[in-house]
């Protein structure tokens, strides 16, 4: 039960994290105009990975995409790449983890296969989270550097948008979303890896013995965790050893229509 809960929670946390990484990547507020010198500006600038925006006090917002690839700073390109890699890995991880979830039955998939898939998705989530955290941190470092170098142009050549000495940029909301989302994805990945350990069958070479006891028949199976095939089978992962008796709450599993999809 604890393994299923850990796996399920890991999946949910990773799902939230990846949704956050996607949101952060799409957000326009990666850097926002520093209002320290002028808290009541009539023009507010903010920039994202894909476009820069200007919000006027009149309520009108104008956004312009960075319609160039070669003109963008290498660091910005690197951040874009890290975020996209994070999203792709996370999405694949989610897909893999759906099939690895213990509560979902797909054919007669062995627990060992589910364990491997859980580990794979866990690693993917960890790398995805690290990519997001790295991307956001690189951008944050870029901002800090530019903040103290008011004459340096952060986006030189970006469609004629040359930063003047007047406008300094500070951390935008997307950075915090990205950090939190990356952290959640990372935590989710770690939880999946922990869950994988509990899912992995402990190989013990016991001989299969079947005998008729007086009154009713009992089947014994080899191996560590009982191999299950049906929806109602051994949800508690009880270990069954030679000479042990089946407990009352265990259900004999029979092939069902759900086993062959």
């Amino acid at each position: 039960m604890a393994v299923t809960a850990c796996q399920g929670l890991g999946f949910v946390v990773s799902l939230i994290g990846i949704a956050g990484i996607i949101a952060a990547t799409c957000m326009d507020q990666w850097s926002t105009q520093d209002l320290y010198n002028n808290p009541v500006t009539a023009v507010f600038n903010y920039q994202g990975l894909w476009r820069s925006c200007v919000r006027e006090s009149s309520g009108f917002t104008e956004c312009r995409g960075y319609f160039t690839l070669l003109g963008l700073p290498a660091m910005l390109q690197a951040v874009r790449a890290l975020m996209i890699v994070g999203i792709v890995l996370g999405a694949i991880g989610l897909l893999v983890s759906i099939f690895a979830l213990k509560c979902i039955r797909i054919g007669s998939m062995e627990d060992s296969a589910k364990a491997n898939m859980t580990l794979t998705s866990g690693i993917m989530f960890i790398v995805s989270g690290l990519c997001a955290i790295a991307g956001v941190s690189v951008f944050a470092n870029m901002l800090v550097t530019n903040f103290w170098m008011s004459t340096a142009n952060m986006y030189t050549g970006m469609g004629g948008m040359v930063q003047t000495v007047q406008t300094r940029y500070t951390f935008g909301a997307a950075l915090f979303v990205g950090w939190v989302a990356g952290g959640l994805t990372l935590i989710g990945g770690v939880m999946m890896c922990i869950a994988c350990r509990g899912l992995a069958p402990e190989e013990t070479n016991y001989k299969a013995v079947s005998y008729h006891a007086s009154g009713h028949s009992v089947a014994y199976k080899p191996g560590g965790f009982k191999a299950s095939t049906g929806f109602g089978s051994n949800t508690k992962n009880k270990k069954i050893y030679d000479g042990g008796a089946r407990t009352e709450d265990e259900v004999q599993s029979y092939p069902s229509k759900h086993d062959y999809v």
């Epitope: 009539a42 200007v54 006090s57 009149s58 309520g59 004629g160 948008m161 930063q163 007047q166």
Partner: antibody
Framework: EVQLVESGGGLVKPGGSLKLSCAAS????????IHWVRQAPEKGLEWVAY????????YYADTVKGRFTISRDNAKNTLFLQMTSLRSEDTAIYYC???????????WGQGTTLTVSS | DIVLTQSPSSLTVTAGEKVTMSCKSS????????????LTWYQQKVGQPPKLLIY???IRECGVPDRFTGSGSGTDFILTISSVQAEDLAVYYC?????????FGAGTKLELK
Amino acid sequence: EVQLVESGGGLVKPGGSLKLSCAASGFTFSDYGIHWVRQAPEKGLEWVAYISSGSSTIYYADTVKGRFTISRDNAKNTLFLQMTSLRSEDTAIYYCAKWDRGNCFDYWGQGTTLTVSS
Amino acid sequence: DIVLTQSPSSLTVTAGEKVTMSCKSSQSLLNSGNQKKYLTWYQQKVGQPPKLLIYWASIRECGVPDRFTGSGSGTDFILTISSVQAEDLAVYYCQNAYSYPLTFGAGTKLELK
């Protein structure tokens, strides 16, 4: 046709109070920020106060801060300027002006005159 | 606060003449985000409220005759009337639209000889 009509001006003694109104029509009032701008006799224009479309942002000129209060009623398409502790230097024509793209006043009312005198 | 200095304070011209008036800002009104200059020009005739002429330093408002032209850098702005007409007699104000408090120049009064 966009129209802004100010009212409520008049003669007030120093230290007195008065409330100006600006009735708007011809545009979606709740979508735009509105300002009060004044002009003293034979003088230039002076910005007084601003209120955003949803009243979430309000700014005042230092000369009126703490004495004037700008507000709006979007349901009635009306802007208000509550003035207290009036001084002789507040004597002016008060205009309400619609704030538009480019941070410009694209439409102005005809103005209402406030005279502060003993 | 941004201070706008208009010059000359008054201009006496003849009809058909080309006129230029200046507006200098104590700070740059150029916004780096969109490369727009947040300076606006208004025309005010006697007994009337001001009328919007030009915003973003050079964009003519709808209905404004093309004889009115705005130009300038981040701090120095010019309003040009290519051929003055009798109906252009008014006071012209420039306005800082970049930061609060919003400020106006003292105005340039255009008179006919």
